[in-house]
Every structure is written in structure tokens, then in C-alpha cells.
Interface confidence: medium
């Protein structure tokens, strides 16, 4: 690495280019200094004077080394279904991500433009593919021998309990009912939950454990109506 830094502006020789934090000014025909993140070019360079930089004003930013005449405006405030995971500063734009229980239906370069609540599978349907940061839950009908009696965005279809003597046969939305003798089950009792997608940037949201007999990694949050779809709850 060089022990010193050459002063700008200077004329680049043929075969050479301006260095990393410099730009070629077409008017001056010189390599000139870029402005650091959080600043913008107040006065452009000339053959004898370098770029004059100034700090970005409130609610504006520049994230990169630049020579823009004005800083960029920070995005609008996050909506109620979003969490601000990065505040607007002079060096970075505001980033809004979807809160737990929601997914990003329309993304932008950083963060999310439009969040939508995760689909809930109605009784008789279980989660085939869990929701992610950017995709909705996919529901599927419970296959013979399995059921789901909940309206949930995390529950999968569970196997019917196996009775020595069946009182009421199970169906897609109800477990089998046994006579008083002890039933056996192919899986552990209690609802089976899939983990709910949590935005990687949602560090400020404290998860609330869902009341359940079995441990769960899902979150219980007030949810609005889901868009109607096969196997999901309608309005």
C-alpha cells in the first residue's frame, strides 16, 4: 500500500484509471475525490480545485462514495404491519420488514414494500409448505388417516389416534374418538407446529409463546383476514 495519497485533482494518463474513491470529471477532465457516505457533492471539482462535499440533510442519505449533487430521500415511515429494522440515517435508508405472522408480498431493493398476513389453513387442511419471509403458507387437504382441527398457519395434518375400539371414526377435520380403553398413537400427543417465518431483521420484536400443551416455536399475533384460497379460511 502507498505510504501517502496523491492529491486530487489530477489528470489520468492513458492506460490508467482514477482510483477507488475518485471519479473522472468530464468537464474538468481530472480524477477528483468522491464524497464519503453521508455526504454529497456541494461543489464539483475543477482543474485546480477538488470536489467540495457537504453532509446530507435530515431524512436524506447517501450509502456509497459518490459525487451526486443531492442526497437521496429516505423512504416513508413503516406501516403498521411492518417493523423498522434499520432507521433512516445520513448513511443509510430506512428498512421496513414484515412483522412475525406476515410475509412480504411485494419486495423492494432493501426491505419490503407490501406485507400480507400468512394464510391460515382451515380445519381439514394442514400446512404443506410453511411461509417464509417472501412466500405465503401453502395448505393441503389432510390425507386419509390424518386430520387437522385447527385454523392455523403452522399446524400440519396429524395422524388419527389408533383406538383398540373406535367410538367415532376420525375424518380430515376431527380425530378418532376411542372407547374408554387407552388409545395408542403413532405420534406424540399435542398439536404439531411448524416454525413460523421470522424476518432475519426482526431483532426488536419479542416473541410471545403460543399457549399449547407442547413446546412451540410459532408466534401468536393478532391477524387480520387472510386472502381466500383453497384450504384457507375465507371471510
Amino acid at each position: 500500500l502507498p505510504a501517502q495519497v496523491a492529491f486530487t485533482p489530477y489528470a489520468p494518463e492513458p492506460g490508467s484509471t482514477c482510483r477507488l474513491r475518485e471519479y473522472y470529471d468530464q468537464t474538468a477532465q481530472m480524477c477528483c475525490s468522491k464524497c464519503s457516505p453521508g455526504q454529497h457533492a456541494k461543489v464539483f471539482c475543477t482543474k485546480t480545485s477538488d470536489t467540495v462535499c457537504d453532509s446530507c440533510e435530515d431524512s436524506t442519505y447517501t450509502q456509497l462514495w459518490n459525487w451526486v449533487p443531492e442526497c437521496l430521500s429516505c423512504g416513508s415511515r413503516c406501516s403498521s404491519d411492518q417493523v423498522e429494522t434499520q432507521a433512516c440515517t445520513r448513511e443509510q435508508n430506512r428498512i421496513c420488514t414484515c412483522r412475525p405472522g406476515w410475509y412480504c408480498a411485494l419486495s423492494k431493493q432493501e426491505g419490503c414494500r407490501l406485507c400480507a398476513p400468512l394464510r391460515k389453513c382451515r380445519p381439514g387442511f394442514g400446512v404443506a409448505r410453511p411461509g417464509t419471509e417472501t412466500s405465503d403458507v401453502v395448505c393441503k387437504p389432510c390425507a386419509p388417516g390424518t386430520f387437522s382441527n385447527t385454523t392455523s398457519s403452522t399446524d400440519i395434518c396429524r395422524p388419527h389416534q389408533i383406538c383398540n375400539v373406535v367410538a367415532i371414526p376420525g375424518n380430515a377435520s376431527m380425530d378418532a374418538v376411542c372407547t374408554s380403553t387407552s388409545p395408542t398413537r403413532s405420534m406424540a400427543p399435542g398439536a404439531v407446529h411448524l416454525p413460523q417465518p421470522v424476518s432475519t431483521r426482526s431483532q426488536h420484536t419479542q416473541p410471545t409463546p403460543e399457549p399449547s400443551t407442547a413446546p412451540s416455536t410459532s408466534f401468536l399475533l393478532p391477524m387480520g383476514p387472510s386472502p381466500p384460497a383453497e384450504g384457507s379460511t375465507g371471510d
Epitope: A6, Y10, A11, P12, P14, G15, C18, R19, M30, K47
Partner: antibody, heavy 119, light 111 residues
Framework: QVQLLESGGGLVQPGGSLRLSCAAS????????MTWVRQAPGKGLEWVSG????????FYADSVKGRFTISRDNSKNTLYLQMNSLRAEDTAVYYC????????????WGQGTLVTVSS | QSVLTQPPSVSGAPGQRVTISCTGS?????????VHWYQQLPGTAPKLLIY???NRPSGVPDRFSGFKSGTSASLAITGLQAEDEADYYC???????????FGGGTKLTVL
Amino acid sequence: QVQLLESGGGLVQPGGSLRLSCAASGFSFTSYAMTWVRQAPGKGLEWVSGISGGGAATFYADSVKGRFTISRDNSKNTLYLQMNSLRAEDTAVYYCARQSQYVGGFDYWGQGTLVTVSS
Amino acid sequence: QSVLTQPPSVSGAPGQRVTISCTGSSSNIGAGYGVHWYQQLPGTAPKLLIYGNTNRPSGVPDRFSGFKSGTSASLAITGLQAEDEADYYCQSYDSSLSGWVFGGGTKLTVL
């Protein structure tokens, strides 16, 4: 490490031709402009010719324009100088050098090859 | 006659400071093109000492420093040592010649 190795020098009669080569290694050859610089016995350095990394742009000193041709074969990492219509005043040690990507200057030099033009 | 003008020789005693000047014109140094300095020890190829007016490549001692003002530049060597005895050349690009130009060279003698 960066290495530049010139070859092709020797004794040639006035009006004759010679082709110098410079084998480059230890760096991305296509990314750098290359140049030839000469030094007559007991004299100073004189820039002769230069070529851009891709080979599209070439530059010549007035003293060799029309007689010398610089070229490069990027597949072989080799720089060339074709010298025609040689004169006694072309007698010199010819150095090949790499041009620095940023700011300029010739940051690596070969050991040189001697060209003697004499009858 | 070189496009860039240097004194033919300079000398100094060990430990002293010497400067070598390089005078150009409005088409080279004065146009804003970088000035580069080379050291050539006897019987060897030139070595880049200073590039872009003031920059030292890694491995070059901080005893060597470059300066530029207007159409002139200079190389300063402090704490002169016997091994500094060599020829020194300045170089720049000249827009009117569309080529690189060297100074005539300066022979440094360490007394």
C-alpha cells in the same frame, strides 16, 4: 511475483529489422497497459511506445513513429516490439515495463535487452 | 534536450538532505499529470520510487518524498546513505506529444 523478461535483442545492420519480446508473469496481463523504454549507452531514459491492456490503443514517440510497431498477445502474456528501418541512434538497452493501473507510472521493469545497430 | 529539465548532478554527505528538481510545462506537469520518480542503480533496470507526485510504493523508505507545485516537481532524500548513489529520473505524460516524457536524469553522488 511480477516478472518481465525481454528477449530478441542483438546486432543488426542499419536498415535491418528486429523483433523484441517481453514475457510477462505474476499478474493479470490483460488488465495492464504495457510500454517499451530504451536507454542508449551512457544516456538517459527515453519512452518508445505504449499499448493499452486490450491492445486497441497504441502510442509512439515521434522518433520511432512509422518504423516501430508495438503489439501484444494476451493469450501468451507477451508484449512485442517490431523494429524496422533501424538506425544507429536506435542502439540502446530496451526495457519493457508495466504501467500502474492507477495514477500512472511504470511500476515493474524487465532487466532489458541490448539492441546494437551497426555495420 | 529533454522535455522535463533536471540538474545533471547533485551531491551530499551521508545523513544530509538533498533535493532534485524537475521542471516541465503546461502540457505535462502543469496540466495536472502525475510526476513519477525512478531510481537507477549502476547496471540495473530503473525502479519506481515515487508515483503520482507524492506516493511511495511499498518497500520504498520514507526518506524519499515527492512534491509538486505548478509546472515543477521535486524529489527530496533525507538521511542520505551510500546506497542512494544512483541516477534519478522524473517522468510525466505530455498531452501535446501524446506520450510519456522523462527528465534527462540526475546523478546523485554521496560524498
